[in-house]
């Protein structure tokens, strides 16, 4: 069951008392009436904040990144951690708070005029150095318009999937990330059995396209766990 810890940064449309009206005719959106809040007090403070398990930075909040909570800790146990402010040490861009990026192991301000050039320079100079790669955010988030004005084609370097053209996602390729095609029906996909395991992939695949999910191929049910083949199949 889900515990009810309300994130104080995201309070929106506080609902009317239970049993309130279910919306105003003529408007597409309304505040939420009659809500069931599991676990009691719906206004629990951020002090009761529970660590949020994650596999990649993109699953965290905008002011967080995904990492092991202890230095040199088990890579399989990762949670969302508060982002690092300017002049703090970093290993990748996602560790730095919004408005900053990671340069030479330190979070520095993203000067609007120079940011794109700095990022491209980082990719060129340190290809193969995992500590300065561009870690992505998400296949459903958007990138600041100050960085990229056109959507990347297949093979273009990207930060996150919204940098890529329609039908492409941003996936790891060696120690960088590039736009790759979203998987179609019947194509082999990666099913991650262990949380965080796709952080280890050098050649990451995209997710399955709309209406498809990554499932074990029917004729491979008898195969051993290690050799099971997963493909994109209709729901």
């Amino acid at each position: 069951t889900l515990n009810s810890v309300l994130n104080s940064n995201a309070i929106k449309n506080l609902p009317p008392p239970l049993g309130g009206a279910a919306g105003h005719p003529g408007s597409a959106v309304s505040a939420a009436p009659g809500i069931l809040y599991p676990g009691g007090n719906k206004y629990q403070t951020i002090d009761n904040y529970q660590p949020y398990p994650c596999a990649e930075d993109e699953e965290c909040g905008t002011d967080e990144y995904c990492a092991s909570p202890t230095r040199g800790g088990d890579a399989g146990v990762q949670i969302c951690l508060a982002c690092r402010k300017r002049r703090k040490r970093c290993m990748r861009h996602a560790m730095c708070c919004p408005g900053n990026y990671c340069k030479n192991g330190i979070c520095v301000s993203s000067d609007q005029n120079h940011f794109r050039g700095e990022i491209e320079e980082t990719i060129t100079e340190s290809f193969g150095n995992d500590h300065s790669t561009l870690d992505g955010y998400s296949r459903r988030t958007t990138l600041s318009s100050k960085m990229y004005h056109t959507k990347g084609q297949e093979g273009s370097v990207c930060l996150r999937s919204s940098d890529c053209a329609s039908g492409l996602c941003c996936a790891r390729h060696f120690w960088s990330k590039i736009c790759k095609p979203v998987l179609k029906e019947g194509q082999v996909c990666t099913k991650h059995r262990r949380k965080g395991s796709h952080g280890l992939e050098i050649f990451q695949r995209c997710y399955c396209g709309e209406g498809l999910s990554c499932r074990i191929q029917k004729d491979h049910h008898q195969a051993s766990n290690s050799s099971r083949l997963h493909t994109c199949q209709r729901h």
Epitope: N7, P15, A32, Y52, E59
Partner: nanobody, 128 residues
Framework: EVQLVESGGGLVQPGGSLRLSCAAS????????MGWFRQAPGKEREFVGA????????TYADSVKGRFTISADNSKNTAYLQMNSLKPEDTAVYYC?????????????????????WGQGTLVTVSS
């Protein structure tokens, strides 16, 4: 301004399937979690499930796990709720909802209704 319009509701027999759609506009779809809630007659609104802004994390209520599937199509700014093996107790008004990616995310962020903007709802009736 966030606008959410649900469609696909209707009458279905027990054991049947329905697919609800939620067309979103007025915001950057990829920066929001898309959730589904429902409210049965005389009951409180309850969390059904949600897909996060990354599309990687999908959460379901225990009552629908294994029967319902949530997905989102960025290119169409649309979220979906595929409902299979429907039961009479699934009868309710189903609401699509959108919650922005917060600065800090907690375990219960997706099931906490006050984080969301809401659609008008679509009625699903499961009856023979």
């Amino acid at each position: 301004e966030v606008q959410l319009v649900e469609s696909g509701g209707g009458l279905v027999q027990p054991g049947g399937s329905l697919r609800l759609s939620c067309a979103a506009s007025g915001f950057t779809f990829g920066d929001y979690a898309m959730g589904w809630f429902r409210q049965a007659p005389g009951k409180e609104r309850e969390f059904v499930g949600a897909i996060d802004w990354s599309g990687r994390r999908i959460t379901y209520a225990d009552s629908v796990k294994g029967r319902f599937t949530i997905s989102a199509d960025n290119s169409k700014n649309t979220a979906y709720l595929q409902m299979n093996s429907l039961k009479p107790e699934d009868t309710a008004v189903y609401y699509c909802a959108a919650a922005p990616r917060p600065k800090r995310v907690s375990v219960s962020y997706f099931s906490t209704a006050s984080n969301y903007d809401w659609g008008q709802g679509t009625l699903v009736t499961v009856s023979s």
